[in-house]
């Protein structure tokens, strides 16, 4: 039950995280105009990964896309790439984890397969979260670097926009959304990996009678099978006696008490 809860919670946390990463990537407020020097401006500038916007006090907002690819700073391109990789990995991870959920039964999928899928999705979520955190952090570092370097008519690291002396940019809402979302995705991934450990098939100690073909007396030893170590290991259980008795692996398996929630 605890395993299912951990897996389910990991999935939900990762889902929220990835939704946040997507939202952050699409948001226009990665950097916002610093109003410290000019708190009474009637024009407010903010910039995203894909376009820059100007909001006039009168309520009109105008946004312009960065219609160049080669003209953009390498750092901005790198941040875009990291965020997109994070989204793609996260989306694949979500897809994999849906099928890996213990509460969802798909055909005769074994627990070992679900454990493998849970681990895979967990790793994907971890990498996705790290990509988002890295992307946001690179952008934040770029902002800090440019903060004191905003000079007239010089291209800076912010989307190639020409900046005049009085306009400086500070952290926008998207950065905080990205950091939190990346963190959630990372936590969700870790939870999936933890859930994977408990998902691996546990060999229950069936007190089943084994019959020897020759009719010789059969040595019976209860509790003789070692439990699997998890993480998808499919180690064959060792026979505890000689002769023609079949191991538990070779006997038709029936659903254990752990198969349903």
């Amino acid at each position: 039950m605890a395993v299912t809860a951990c897996q389910g919670l990991g999935f939900v946390v990762s889902l929220i995280g990835i939704a946040g990463i997507i939202a952050a990537t699409c948001m226009d407020q990665w950097s916002t105009q610093d109003l410290y020097n000019n708190p009474v401006t009637a024009v407010f500038n903010y910039q995203g990964l894909w376009r820059s916007c100007v909001r006039e006090s009168s309520g009109f907002t105008e946004c312009r896309g960065y219609f160049t690819l080669l003209g953009l700073p390498a750092m901005l391109q790198a941040v875009r790439a990291l965020m997109i990789v994070g989204i793609v990995l996260g989306a694949i991870g979500l897809l994999v984890s849906i099928f890996a959920l213990k509460c969802i039964r798909i055909g005769s999928m074994e627990d070992s397969a679900k454990a493998n899928m849970t681990l895979t999705s967990g790793i994907m979520f971890i990498v996705s979260g790290l990509c988002a955190i890295a992307g946001v952090s690179v952008f934040a570092n770029m902002l800090v670097t440019n903060f004191w370097m905003s000079t007239a008519n010089m291209y800076t690291g912010m989307g190639g926009m020409v900046q005049t002396v009085q306009t400086r940019y500070t952290f926008g809402a998207a950065l905080f959304v990205g950091w939190v979302a990346g963190g959630l995705t990372l936590i969700g991934g870790v939870m999936m990996c933890i859930a994977c450990r408990g998902l691996a098939p546990e060999e229950t100690n069936y007190k089943a009678v084994s019959y020897h073909a020759s009719g010789h007396s059969v040595a019976y030893k209860p509790g003789g099978f070692k439990a699997s170590t998890g993480f998808g290991s499919n180690t064959k259980n060792k026979k505890i006696y000689d002769g023609g008795a079949r191991t538990e692996d070779e006997v038709q398996s029936y659903p254990s008490k752990h198969d349903y929630v």
Partner: antibody
Framework: QVQLKESGPGLVAPSQSLSITCTVS????????VSWVRQPPGKGLEWLGV???????NYHSTLISRLRISKDKSKSQVFLKLNSLQTDDTATYYC???????????WGQGTSVTVSS | DIVMTQSPSSLTVTAGEKVTMSCKSS????????????LTWYQQKPGQPPKLLIY???TRESGVPDRFTGSGSGTDFTLTISSVQAEDLAVYYC?????????FGAGTKLELK
């Protein structure tokens, strides 16, 4: 079409308060800002303050302690209240709608206010 | 506060003449985000409220004749009337729309000879 109309007292005694109402039509006060501008007789324009669509206000630094601008969205009215009037507050008071570029694209006809005892 | 200085204070012209008037601001009105100058020109005829002519320093308001042209950037701006008509006789004001308070210039009065 867009229209703005100011209505004021005409004559106000010194040290009293001035209250002017601007009634608008043809646009929503939740979407557009309304500025107040005054013009003393034979002189230039002086921007007083503005109330934006979201209800936030900005005032001229010289009038910030005496001026208050508010609105009643349901009645499509904007109000100007100027306290502690002096004779140099005598002017024609205009309300105007803010448009693109923060420019004032539509103006009322103005209301003349004289501060005199 | 941004101070707007207009010159000359008055202009005497003849019909059909080309006229230019200047407006200077104490601070740059150029916004880096959209590369637009937040300067507005108004025309005020006697006994009438002001009328919007040009915003963003060079964008004509709809219905304004194309003989009116705004130009300039940063701190120096110009309003040009290519061929003055009798109905153009008025006072012309420039306004800072970039930073509060949204200050006006003292105006340039256009008169006929």
């Amino acid at each position: 079409q867009v229209q703005l109309k100011e209505s004021g007292p005409g004559l106000v005694a010194p040290s009293q308060s001035l209250s002017i109402t601007c009634t608008v039509s043809g646009f929503s006060l939740t979407s557009y800002g309304v500025s107040w501008v005054r013009q003393p007789p034979g002189k230039g324009l002086e921007w007083l303050g503005v109330i934006w669509g979201d209800g936030s206000t900005n005032y001229h630094s010289t009038l910030i302690s005496r001026l208050r601008i508010s609105k009643d969205k349901s009645k499509s009215q904007v109000f100007l209240k100027l306290n502690s009037l002096q004779t140099d507050d005598t002017a024609t008071y205009y309300c105007a709608k803010a448009g693109r570029g923060n420019a004032l694209d539509y103006w009322g006809q103005g209301t003349s206010v004289t501060v005199s005892s | 506060d941004i101070v707007m200085t207009q010159s000359p204070s008055s202009l005497t012209v003849t019909a059909g003449e080309k006229v230019t008037m200047s407006c200077k601001s104490s601070q740059s009105l150029l916004n880096s985000g959209n590369q637009k100058n937040y300067l507005t020109w108004y025309q005020q005829k006697p006994g009438q409220p002001p009328k919007l002519l040009i915003y963003w320093a060079s964008t004509r308001e709809s219905g304004v004749p194309d003989r009116f042209t705004g130009s300039g950037s940063g701190t120096d701006f110009t309003l040009t009337i290519s061929s003055v008509q009798a109905e153009d006789l008025a006072v012309y004001y420039c306004q800072n729309d970039y930073s509060f308070p949204l200050t006006f210039g003292a105006g340039t009065k256009l008169e006929l000879k």
